[in-house]
Amino acid sequence: PEPPTACREKQYLINSQCCSLCQPGQKLVSDCTEFTETECLPCGESEFLDTWNRETHCHQHKYCDPNLGLRVQQKGTSETDTICTCEEGWHCTSEACESCVLHRSCSPGFGVKQIATGVSDTICEPCPVGFFSNVSSAFEKCHPWTSCETKDLVVQQAGTNKTDVVCGPQDRLRA
């Protein structure tokens, strides 16, 4: 038979032979030959390979460096890498989560639209008319202005995006 030019899924071509790839969690020790099947060995402690492969070395698990504000979210296995996340109040600077920065606070006049997670920063939005925020916060949303009418009071000072309205008693001298 003619030597193959292409191999099946989970195989690779070497020396005109189709060899089995090593399964996730194992590395290649020896290519298959005319006489032998591919030889694979499990990855060691703190190593992984996450695909069918012909790698002769496993990858090291990611280290979640506490000095960079990182902690382990999910421990790695022989088939998966460690997943890092950030300590409370911090979030990852990139998708790879290699370092952390403090969550952003929303300035007065802005409220929190979406609270930060370990992997995403705080999303702020300007307080629309009828709402305000008078603090710098990573948690506070824009609050609605106080409704003076429901308290049987009148607006003495109009609200802004940073301040609430000021209510006062109704002027009883008026007709």
Epitope: T33, E34, F35, T36
Partner: antibody
């Protein structure tokens, strides 16, 4: 071209040890196992075992496991087979062989065990 | 260990005529990967063995097409379609499916 060149003939006394070498050339030494096979006079072949030069990993015929030692020196692309506690039945031609993209044999090393 | 039994022990042949050697294994040589690791080789007097066929029916590079292999499971055959003078020697089968690898006792092919 691929070549396996073995060390010369040996004469040993019973109880002694012998170390046969197999120098490889013409290919990347660490890419293929080296296997050892022997053939007693007028007899068939017997598989001793193999060694992976990449990591020193071995597999053996259980019959030889306690007496045979397989090693490599990757700096000089050479494999070694040492057989200890020799007896007269170990008199044979010892071959090293490599397969993968063809099969290659050394020229053989005659080991004679005699008192 | 897997026992490999070859027959006949000796095979006198006429030049230009076909020859056939049988090899039986004591257990199946079908590997879990779907391959059957049964091989044939020739040894001329005073020489190292020379492989002819691997995995039942695949000829090594440079092996004349008068050599062919067939079989499956435990029953295998090497055929020489027209024997030539250079074909004299001992023919061995071997298996590398199971450890330890084992060999047949050999079949001596000689010209009548």
């Amino acid at each position: 071209q691929v070549q396996l060149v073995q060390s010369g003939a040996e004469v040993k006394k019973p109880g002694a040890s012998v170390k046969v070498s197999c120098k490889a050339s013409g290919y990347t030494f660490i890419s293929y196992y080296i296997y050892w096979v022997r053939q007693a006079p007028g007899q068939g072949l017997e598989w001793i075992g193999g060694i992976n030069p990449r990591n020193g990993g071995t597999n053996f015929n259980e019959k030889f496991k306690s007496r045979a030692t397989l090693t490599v020196d990757t700096s000089i692309s050479t494999a070694y087979m040492e057989l200890s506690r020799l007896r007269s039945e170990d008199t044979a031609v010892y071959y090293c062989t490599r397969h993968g993209n063809g099969v290659y044999w050394g020229q053989g090393t005659t080991v004679t065990v005699s008192s | 260990d897997v026992v490999m039994t070859q027959s006949p022990l000796s095979l006198p042949v006429t030049l230009g005529q076909p020859a056939s050697i049988s090899c039986r294994s004591s257990q199946s040589l079908l590997h879990s990967n779907g391959n059957t690791y049964l091989h044939w080789y020739q040894q001329r007097p005073g020489q190292s063995p020379n492989h002819l066929i691997y995995q039942v029916s695949n000829r090594f590079s440079g092996v004349p097409d008068r050599f062919s292999g067939s079989g499956s499971g435990t029953d295998f055959t090497l055929k020489i379609s027209r024997v030539e003078a250079e074909d004299v020697g001992v023919y061995f089968c071997s298996q590398t499916t199971h450890v330890p690898w084992t060999f047949g006792g050999g079949t001596k092919v000689e010209i009548k």
